[in-house]
């Protein structure tokens, strides 16, 4: 048998070997495809199948617009002028080249020593599904699950049967100061079909920088709490990788495990004081937050708020 590859939507002509080019012809075309359950013999007079597979006057079979459901086997049996039976057998596969792949949501830059999402490569409208590959500086990137991670997703359109592929690339660059170029290519895996490439993206790799800012958040707001209450201090840092955070109270380090959150449950007067956090980044010095003050006070110690109503129901003015 002969393997035939046809593009979806394009016509395909299969010749019936041995068939006389003009009637009278003794021939039979039959097909087993996604449109049939078993072999379907086509009527030489034509009929409802002509819209998908039609016998031409010369005995060839015309598929006016091949579709996914036309994949399968086509056979012709003809008797030539000398009375000898000649058989033709075709295995038809269809394909569709997708639109040019694109890298969506590309990174603006990368940070050394930490995982960075480079971007997501998207290919829409392929058949069969095909594959997406990433390239670094023109060389194929092989995902190792550690420094190079690829997350893939394949979806099929319920009506057209065509595929959409997505491939998300995450890398851990080893050093800063470089400018790697990433690209993505789609391949159908068919002979004589060149891969489709995205436009390359060139990204700067920077060393992990110092935190851009360090903020100390306190709950309850204002740092005033009743005895037995809970205080939560959160050290907010915008640095990658997240640095180690230590805590200082009244100028002295607290003997606690590093954590960006300090919880003070059931506070007493001994917890009062000035707190700050210190972020230590591997490649940079420590950075201290502005301090916050914690005060433990009975409610009402400061008197009612201005103009509030006391128990007598009369307004009091401080």
């Amino acid at each position: 048998g002969q393997n035939i590859t046809a593009r979806i939507g394009e016509p395909l002509v299969l010749s019936c070997k041995g068939a006389p080019k003009k009637p009278p012809q003794q021939l039979e075309w039959k097909l087993n495809t996604g449109r049939t359950e078993a072999w379907k013999v086509l009527s030489p007079q034509g009929g409802p199948w002509d819209s998908v597979a039609r016998i031409l006057p010369n005995g060839s079979l015309l598929l006016p617009a091949t579709g996914i459901v036309d994949e399968g086997t086509f056979r012709c049996r003809a008797t030539n002028r000398r009375g000898k039976e000649v058989k033709s057998n075709y295995r038809v596969r269809v394909y569709q080249i997708p639109g040019k792949p694109e890298i969506v949501d590309p990174a603006s830059e990368l940070t050394a020593s930490v995982p960075n999402k480079v971007g997501t490569c998207v290919s829409e409208g392929s058949y069969p599904a095909g594959t997406l590959s990433w390239h670094l500086d023109g060389k194929l990137l092989i995902p190792d699950g550690k420094e190079t991670l690829v997350k893939e997703e394949t979806r099929r359109h319920p009506e057209t049967g065509l595929f959409t592929l997505r491939s998300e690339l995450t890398v851990i660059p080893t050093q800063g100061g470089t400018h790697p170029t990433f690209s993505c290519s789609f391949s159908l895996g068919l002979p004589r079909r060149r891969p489709l490439n995205t436009a390359p993206i060139q990204l700067r790799v920077r060393e992990p920088g110092p935190p851009e800012g360090i903020q100390l958040l306190v709950e309850p707001e204002g740092g005033i709490v009743a005895p037995g209450g809970t205080v939560t201090l959160t050290c907010a840092i915008s640095a990658q990788p997240p640095p180690q955070v230590h805590w200082i109270k009244d100028g002295a380090p607290l003997p606690l495990a590093p954590s960006p959150v300090l919880l003070l449950p059931e506070v007493g007067h001994e917890d009062e004081g000035t707190y700050s956090c210190v972020a230590t980044h591997p490649s940079h010095g420590p950075q201290e937050s502005p301090p916050v003050s914690i005060r433990v006070t009975e409610t009402g110690d400061e008197g009612p708020a201005e103009g509030s109503v006391g128990e007598s129901g009369l307004g009091t003015l401080a």
């Epitope: 409802p48 002509d50 819209s51």
Partner: antibody, heavy 119, light 107 residues
Framework: EVQLVESGGGLVQPGGSLRLSCAAS????????MTWVRQAPGKGLEWVAS????????YYPDSVKDRFTISRDNAKNSLYLQMNSLRAEDTAVYYC????????????WGQGTLVTVSS | DIQMTQSPSSLSASVGDRVTITCRAS??????VNWFQQKPGKAPRRLIY???NLADGVPSRFSGSRSGTDFTLTISSLQPEDFATYYC?????????FGGGTKVEIK
């Protein structure tokens, strides 16, 4: 809205001729095969003719072959049935319908037009 | 030519009844069978296409099934508006062939 409207029916003598028309709207006419189906009074449905989307290929049952001709004008979104040598047994309501191949088979119908063959 | 033998030719049923109509093809027609409903003085309306698929806008009480060359239209719970004549159609080969019809009447 997808619509088919037949016209041209009427009373005709045996041996006479009549031309039916079907005006299509609401869809891309030249993407579809088209078909005529008839129904004699009090009887069932009978296929009369089909034509492919280009108009190059036509199909008929033996009962009307060589007497009826189906045609189409894609520029005018119109389907026609030329009926010659009419007989009493051709008396029926004639419907035009969209499709007729294995891809789309008679999914939309017109309201029908009555053809009476009588002397 | 393919024959489509439809049965019964008529039936009486009540609202809420389950109704089954069968068409048998004289040879293999694959999945290429439709079912139509026709009310007096109106054009046929397609209910089921390619043996088992419900056409747009058709209530889900209608369903189609196939076993070899036997095709079945089922109305799970007959409604007042379902009293009509039903036809099957084979469109695998020319001539396209309709079944003889089944008239569903009120008991």
């Amino acid at each position: 809205e997808v619509q088919l409207v037949e016209s041209g029916g009427g009373l005709v003598q045996p041996g006479g001729s009549l031309r039916l028309s079907c005006a299509a709207s609401g869809f891309t006419f030249n993407n579809y095969w088209m078909t005529w189906v008839r129904q004699a009074p009090g009887k069932g449905l009978e296929w009369v003719a089909s034509i492919d989307n280009s108009g190059d290929n036509t199909y008929y049952p033996d009962s009307v072959k060589d007497r009826f001709t189906i045609s189409r004008d894609n520029a005018k979104n119109s389907l026609y049935l030329q009926m010659n040598s009419l007989r009493a047994e051709d008396t029926a309501v004639y419907y035009c319908a969209r499709g007729g191949d294995i891809l789309v088979s008679l999914d939309v119908w017109g309201q029908g037009t009555l053809v009476t063959v009588s002397s | 030519d393919i024959q489509m033998t439809q049965s019964p030719s008529s039936l009486s049923a009540s609202v809420g009844d389950r109704v089954t109509i069968t068409c048998r093809a004289s040879q293999d027609v694959g999945i290429y069978v439709n079912w139509f409903q026709q009310k007096p003085g109106k054009a046929p309306r397609r209910l089921i296409y390619r043996a088992t698929n419900l056409a747009d806008g058709v209530p889900s009480r209608f369903s189609g099934s196939r076993s070899g060359t036997d095709f079945t239209l089922t109305i799970s719970s007959l409604q007042p508006e379902d009293f009509a004549t039903y036809y099957c159609l084979e469109f695998d080969e020319h001539p396209l062939t309709f079944g003889g019809g089944t008239k569903v009447e009120i008991k």
